[in-house]
Amino acid sequence: VPRWRQQWSGPGTTKRFPETVLARCVKYTEIHPEMRHVDCQSVWDAFKGAFISKHPCNITEEDYQPLMKLGTQTVPCNKILLWSRIKDLAHQFTQVQRDMFTLEDTLLGYLADDLTWCGEFNTSKINYQSCPDWRKDCSNNPVSVFWKTVSRRFAEAACDVVHVMLNGSRSKIFDKNSTFGSVEVHNLQPEKVQTLEAWVIHGGREDSRDLCQDPTIKELESIISKRNIQFSCKNIYRPDKFLQCVKNPEDSSCTSEI
């Protein structure tokens, strides 16, 4: 008799999830010599232990504690780049500017980037059919709780000047409901963080508007200022040129506004 299985509204666990996490861990520890001591089998066991046999709407930050411990890593607190709705450019940037870090440049962020996972209560099975959707089903699901946990810890670790890359092509350049707007902004530590500097990335080539005057940016400035953190904002009019100038800062065309 086939067992009844809960149908959730979101996509199921990414296929070959265990193999993917393990392979990513091995790759990361090979690329980053300072993480070579990490036992990737233990990392997978801790990851699995956070959600296997647990109701996928009842996951807590505590469930991920064993994984957090194994993911201990040095991150220069003044070299943190946050992002919202513009992940690809943020990652292209840190691939060039190697001393800066997004969350996905850390082991834990790298392991989980773009993956979905969930289990089922009282069975050791991974659910490849469906997983809870944050809006339609529940917010305390394995994926959402993971990202909320690591995003909070990443923001807590930041110091001095923190940068955030924002997508100027979206109707809400700063979205209070994004991970940046709902988690990271509120977990920057005012005693450690002096300034949040927003980089607003323009989409259209002919777009010369000052998007730092956008009402949602003003809202971000207000939230940050109330937390006793200074705020600054820069328009990145030409992201292609911006990346090029990060690669080759001596280029004569890089002295003008980007």
């Epitope: 411990k69 201990t72 040095t74 850390t106 810890r153 530590q189 005693e191 450690k192």
Partner: nanobody, 117 residues
Framework: EVQVLESGGGLVQPGGSLRLSCEAS????????MSWVRLAPGKGLEWVST????????SYADSVKGRFTISRDNSKNTLYLQMNSLRAEDTAVYYC??????????RGQGTLVTVSS
């Protein structure tokens, strides 16, 4: 600016004890969870222990549980690590860091603990 100064390390025989201290400044000490992490020769950064801002909650790595005790004195802005039943594998430079991890930027010079007969 967060500043920390670790002390108390030294050479000790297996089974021996040490007490590490970390004096912190530049921030409201009691507002922050604090952690000890260690860097052993040829290995990567390992989390050892964390204590909440009030001192009411503590957690430990499995490798040190039952042997190490973390504590703090908020009136002195100081973090401690009492290390008992020391083993050769505890040999490392010990750093204190603000926060609970897993992302750390330790600011001090650390204090070297060598366990050897």
């Amino acid at each position: 600016e967060v500043q920390v100064l670790e002390s108390g390390g030294g050479l000790v025989q297996p089974g021996g004890s040490l007490r590490l201290s970390c004096e912190a400044s530049g921030f409201t000490f009691s507002n922050f969870a604090m952690s000890w992490v260690r860097l052993a020769p040829g290995k990567g950064l390992e989390w050892v222990s964390t204590i909440s801002g009030s001192g009411g909650s503590t957690s430990y790595a499995d490798s040190v549980k039952g042997r190490f005790t973390i504590s703090r004195d908020n009136s002195k802005n100081t973090l401690y690590l009492q290390m008992n039943s020391l083993r050769a594998e505890d040999t490392a430079v010990y750093y204190c860091a603000d926060g609970r991890g897993p992302f750390f930027d330790y600011r001090g010079q650390g204090t070297l603990v060598t366990v050897s007969s």
